[in-house]
Interface confidence: low
């Protein structure tokens, strides 16, 4: 019969014949022959292969380096790599999460719209009229101005996006 020029899924062509690929979590030890199956071996501890493959070496699990602010989010298996994330207060510099940077703080006049996660930075928004923020924070939202009326007081000093209103007593009308 004619030697094959293409093989089925999960097979590969070698020496004019189709051999089975090694399953995820295993590496290739020796190709199949006319008489023997492909020989595969499981990856060692701290190693993985995540596809059907003909690799002769497994990949090392990613190291989540605490010196770069990283910690393990999900431990690797023989079929999956370790997933790193950042310590609280930090976020990944890339999708691969190879290092971490400090979460941004929202300046006075801005509040936190969305608190940062392990993979995304703080999202800030300007405090709208009626709200203020007088701190630089990675957590604080804009606060509403104090309602002087509900305290039977009057506004003595208008609020801004960075300061609360100042309330004071109502002027008493003389009899």
């Amino acid at each position: 019969p004619e030697p094959p020029t293409a093989c089925r899924e999960k097979q590969y062509l070698i020496n004019s014949q189709c051999c089975s690929l090694c399953q995820p979590g295993q590496k290739l030890v020796s190709d199949c022959t006319e008489f023997t199956e492909t020989e595969c071996l499981p990856c060692g501890e701290s190693e993985f292969l995540d596809t059907w493959n003909r690799e002769t070496h497994c990949h090392q699990h990613k190291y989540c380096d605490p010196n770069l602010g990283l910690r393990v989010q999900q431990k690797g298996t023989s079929e999956t790599d370790t997933i790193c994330t950042c310590e609280e207060g930090w976020h990944c510099t890339s999708e691969a999460c190879e290092s971490c940077v400090l979460h941004r703080s929202c300046s006075p006049g801005f509040g936190v719209k969305q608190i940062a996660t392990g993979v995304s930075d703080t999202i800030c928004e300007p405090c709208p009229v009626g709200f203020f923020s007088n701190v630089s924070s990675a957590f604080e939202k804009c606060h509403p101005w104090t309602s002087c009326e509900t305290k039977d007081l009057v506004v003595q000093q208008a609020g801004t996006n960075k300061t609360d209103v100042v309330c004071g007593p109502q002027d008493r009308l003389r009899a």
């Epitope: 010196n67 602010g69 290092s99 971490c100 940077v101 400090l102 703080s105 630089s136």
Partner: nanobody, 121 residues
Framework: EVQLLESGGGLVQPGGSLRLSCAAS????????MMWVRQAPGKGLEWVST????????YYADSVKGRFTISRDNSKNTLYLQMNSLRAEDTAVYYC??????????????WGQGTLVTVSS
């Protein structure tokens, strides 16, 4: 020109306290995270602590956590390190550094001349 000038080191008994200061000049202090690093005799540089731009977030090496407190006063362009419950292994030259990579302990482009802390009975 960027300058960082540490002070406050000295000889202290185990269990004692010291407060280090670092006066910064030549750059906009509040725009930078700042850090303390130290070098024990015959050893390499060891990261100690980092503080965010406005002092709202602080980080510490496990070896000093609960004993050291980093703080800053942006109005005075000064960084501080309060060191309590000092141990012999805290003996080192302490440097303050301008943390330019915005990483917890990921590099610095300027540091001072250092102040020596000796913990001994």
């Amino acid at each position: 020109e960027v300058q960082l000038l540490e002070s406050g080191g000295g000889l202290v008994q185990p269990g004692g306290s010291l407060r280090l200061s670092c006066a910064a000049s030549g750059f906009t202090f509040s725009h930078y995270m700042m850090m303390w690093v130290r070098q024990a005799p015959g050893k390499g540089l060891e990261w100690v602590s980092t503080i965010s731009h406005f002092g709202d977030i602080t980080y510490y090496a496990d070896s000093v956590k609960g004993r050291f407190t980093i703080s800053r006063d942006n109005s005075k362009n000064t960084l501080y390190l309060q060191m309590n419950s000092l141990r012999a292994e805290d003996t080192a030259v302490y440097y303050c550094a301008k943390n330019d990579m915005v990483m917890k302990n990921g590099g610095f482009d300027y540091w001072g001349q250092g102040t020596l802390v000796t913990v001994s009975s």
